[in-house]
């Protein structure tokens, strides 16, 4: 007798007495930037502080009637979803409410900025335990709102935002598009994207994961014991804010990067029907629904990686796309993808002291994406080994020559467009284990890393027949760090990682008479961290 | 996620004869003006003036005061609604859009963003 949304994110087998106890103490504090709330509701009574913060625009219309219960509706429901004693996710968590949305649910970027600054000031005046900020609101893309979120995140605050309800690319909205924010889309009881009238949940590369957001039962401001159902990405974000509060309550030392990686790792994968999303967004949208991760005591020390997509480069000949990891994360590999196949490859380069993944468009190309594999590994130290394009002669292997360094990724690019050249093999574990192999016209970049107990291996899967994509997955206990396409007779569109699966995409020429030598191969570099062991390359 | 979304970024410059009115404003604006791509969500008349990251607290207040002074000389009244410092240096100002060109020429200004609406989701 537990509502579907709570069962979905905290499966019964994983619930502990501590997690489900509404009277348990929590050192985590959640700040909610929303409408006013009814703090006397049975769900949240005694665990909500209404701050004196109020920065809202006037309501529209001369005849607008401020009815308290309507003014409080959105915020009360969300406060209940986060920490409600019965319908809440993190039942013991204390919550602070800041009013940045008026009775019509409208606010301003400036009001939100002042609210974020208020939180920062509170943090400076009275430092406390871990802080989570829930932003169940969205406006158009705002550089300054994203910057404020970034600065607050740098102080150790975890920000969770609604992806938006516009059935659109979340990257066009703020704070959803801020990289430092955990951005949440909404799914229903069938794990499908939420439709809201003619619109629905936002999607795309700026969404980190999805969470329940349809027909969510929670506190109603109509009366102090009333409940109602509401839908939206706000409700989804509130679930994730609750999960984050529970994670921090178990392990207050978790950083934003670790929280995000663990949310991604332990989410339920591949349950969303991606056909709901526009075709060009499907590859960019994460197919994962949030669940409460187990505690770090049970799963500590493993290599955690996620895929970060860049914005689309645009179609100009010299266009580039750049994907960045979070400051704490290490860029272990870089690949690229183009729907037309016209690209000049990818490389890792340093910009402002940070390694970034760069993809290069080619003449006649419609644009490229850079795909970074961003990982968390204690005491990791990486370097890039480059081999410039040889003007003539045999293929040039690039390997990791520093002691105890292992290959985690290969990148390659051409200075000039040469689609024929792209159809040459680039990496062959059977002949040169632990090496990136380029051909005479490509610059090859090997990503070589050292960390205690880091070991890696290449895993390949080839298809000789007609195919649009080839995949290879790292087995349990191993984490995908690098992904490349080794093309056969067809033009490679590129390669990218989806969770622990390497996807090689090709434009199939439809030739069924290919020899195995011409097979298109997806090559994954799979790594694991065994802190007691020495760094090593595992020969298959 | 994103460095710049679907965004209106405009370079505004004052006519040259107006530059001579105030010596301090004589350098060409390198700062940009940004506003929401969705026109219905824009709130013209309220602007967040964002200063360079290293700008000191005192310089933020001086910059806001300088803008008020320049505006007053042109017969405009502007209201500084809030000064930001804890997350980024800048200030929120209510003023005529006529003054944007002038504001973009202020020292330390990185960009100016027009205020816009956000909505409960």
């Amino acid at each position: 007798s537990i509502p579907w949304n709570l069962e979905r994110i905290i499966p019964a087998w994983q619930q502990t007495e501590e997690d489900s106890s509404p009277d348990g103490s929590s050192q985590v504090e959640v700040y909610l930037l929303d409408t006013s709330i009814q703090s006397g509701h049975r769900e949240i009574e005694g665990r909500v502080t209404i701050t004196d913060f109020n920065s809202v625009p006037e309501e529209d219309g001369t005849r607008f009637h401020r009815q308290a219960s309507k003014c409080d509706s959105h915020g009360t429901h969300l406060a209940g979803v986060v920490s409600g004693r019965d319908a809440g996710v993190a039942k013991g968590t204390s919550l602070h409410s800041l009013r940045v949305l008026n009775c019509q649910g409208k606010g301003t970027v400036s009001g939100t900025l002042i609210g974020l600054e208020f939180i920062r000031k509170s943090q400076l005046i009275q430092p406390s335990g871990p802080l989570v900020v829930l932003l169940p609101l969205a406006g158009g893309y705002s550089r300054i709102l994203n910057t404020a979120c970034q600065r607050l995140a740098r102080t150790g605050v975890v920000l969770v935002a609604a992806a938006g309800n516009f059935r659109d690319d979340a990257c066009l909205y703020s704070p959803a598009s801020a990289p430092e924010v955990i951005t949440v889309g909404a799914t229903n009881a069938q794990d499908q994207p939420v439709t809201l009238g003619t619109l629905g949940t936002n999607f795309g590369r700026c969404v980190d994961l999805f969470a329940p957001g349809k027909d969510i039962i929670g506190a109603s401001s109509d009366c102090s014991t009333c409940y109602m159902s509401q839908s939206g990405t706000s409700q989804a974000a509130a679930h994730v804010a609750g999960i984050v509060a529970m994670m921090l309550n178990r392990d207050p030392a978790l950083t934003l990067a670790e929280l995000r990686q663990r949310l991604i790792l332990f989410s339920t994968k591949d349950v969303i029907n991606m056909a709901w999303f526009p075709e060009d967004q499907r590859v960019l949208t994460p197919n994962r629904v949030a669940t409460l991760p187990p505690s770090t005591q049970e799963t500590g020390g493993q290599l955690l990686c996620r895929t970060v997509w860049s914005a689309h480069s645009g179609p100009t000949r010299t266009a580039t796309a750049t994907a960045r990891c979070a400051p704490e994360e290490e860029l272990l590999s870089c690949s690229s993808f183009s729907r037309s196949g016209r690209r000049r490859g990818d490389r890792i380069e340093a910009i402002g002291g940070q390694q970034v993944c760069k993809a290069l468009n080619a003449f006649g190309g419609e644009g490229v994406y850079a795909v970074a594999r961003c990982c968390l590994l204690p005491r990791v130290n990486c370097s890039i080994h480059n081999t410039p394009a040889a003007r003539a002669g045999p293929q040039t292997p690039v390997h990791c020559h520093q002691k105890d360094h292992v290959l985690t990724g290969c990148s390659f690019h051409w200075e000039v467009e040469n689609l024929r050249a792209q159809q040459q093999p680039l990496l062959r574990s059977r002949h040169q284990p632990g090496q990136c192999v380029g051909h005479q016209e490509a610059s090859v970049h090997a990503s070589c890393c050292h960390a205690p107990g880091l070991e890696c291996k290449i895993k390949e899967h080839g298809i000789a027949g007609p195919a649009e994509q080839v995949t290879v997955a790292c087995e349990a206990g191993w984490t995908l760090t690098g992904c490349n396409v080794l093309p056969g007779a067809s033009l490679p569109l590129g390669a990218y990682s989806v969770d622990n699966v390497c996807v090689a995409r090709i434009r199939d020429a439809g030739r069924a008479d290919r020899t195995s030598e011409e097979a298109t191969v997806a090559a994954a570099i799979c790594c694991r961290s065994r802190p007691s062991a020495k760094a090593s390359w595992v020969h298959q | 996620q994103d460095e710049d979304g679907d965004y209106e970024e405009l370079m505004l410059a004052l006519p040259s004869q107006e530059d001579s009115l105030v010596d301090e404003a004589s350098h060409v604006a390198t700062a940009t003006f940004r506003r929401c791509s969705k026109e219905a969500w824009r709130l013209p008349g309220t602007y967040v003036v964002v200063l360079m990251e290293e700008t000191q607290r005192l310089q933020v207040e001086q910059t806001a005061h300088r803008l008020q002074t320049w505006a007053a000389r042109r017969g405009y009244v502007i209201k500084v609604l809030h000064v930001f410092y804890d997350l980024f240096p800048g200030f929120l100002v209510k003023m005529s859009s006529d003054l944007l060109g002038l504001a973009l020429k202020l020292p330390h200004v990185e960009y100016i963003e027009e205020d816009s609406l956000v909505f409960a989701q």
Partner: antibody
């Protein structure tokens, strides 16, 4: 048939504590909040508080905080109310009453009542 | 706390009469009001919830109405088994509060 069977009458001395029980049958125990209501002799009803049997979450009337503690034992479908530091003011009939659980969100009433437990505090 | 007032503490009526019991709240309670019946032996039953909704198994001669702060319970055709004390109860704000009760007797 739904039944809430309360424990029998209690005669206790001032300063002592007492624990009253309410055993539910005929319905799924976790589908209803368990409320407790006090009725002093010849007086009206006073709501003491409620408990959600799913997770033990409680709400109390401020007046009874520190006086009453509500608990449940899911395995036996029984709710308990402990009253401590008893005085003659606590002499009353105490009722348990089942009210609709939160996700049946139109159910803000006490559907089923126990027969009442008479508590007498006297030296 | 919201005060619930039942001004009539006792009421005498004849069998077959139409009886109205009133209840007022110290502030608006938006129809979040229930009515209960307590028989002389102490048994308590729910009659009406949310101002006017009849609880299952309750005879249709019972009805409720009201809004804002003023509410009433009506028994259209008084029967012998209706002899009891009737309480109103609000659930607009915690704590739940009850009226002082109206005792209904037969003339």
């Amino acid at each position: 048939e739904v039944q809430l069977q309360q424990s029998g009458p209690e005669l206790v001395k001032p300063g002592a504590s007492v624990k009253i029980s309410c055993k539910a049958s005929g319905y799924t125990f976790t589908d209803y909040y368990m409320n407790w209501v006090k009725q002093s002799h010849g007086k009206s009803l006073e709501w003491i508080g409620d408990i959600n049997p799913n997770n033990g979450g409680t709400s109390y009337n401020q007046k009874f905080k520190g006086k009453a503690t509500l608990t449940v034992d899911k395995s036996s479908s029984t709710a308990y109310m402990e009253l401590r530091s008893l005085t003659s003011e606590d002499s009353a009939v105490y009722y348990c009453a089942g009210g609709g659980i939160y996700y049946r969100y139109d159910r803000n009433y006490f559907d089923y009542w126990g027969q009442g437990t008479t508590l007498t505090v006297s030296s | 706390d919201i005060q619930m007032t039942q001004t009539t503490s006792s009421l005498s009526a004849s069998l077959g009469d139409r009886v109205t019991i009133s209840c007022s709240a110290s502030q608006g309670i938006s129809n979040y009001l229930n009515w209960y019946q307590q028989k002389p032996d102490g048994t308590v039953k729910l009659l009406i919830y949310y101002t006017s909704s009849l609880h299952s198994g309750v005879p249709s001669r019972f009805s409720g109405s009201g809004s804002g702060t003023d509410y009433s319970l009506t028994i259209s055709n008084l029967e012998p088994e209706d002899i009891a004390t009737y309480y109103c109860q609000q659930y607009s704000k915690l704590p739940f509060t009850f009226g002082s009760g109206t005792k209904l007797e037969i003339k």
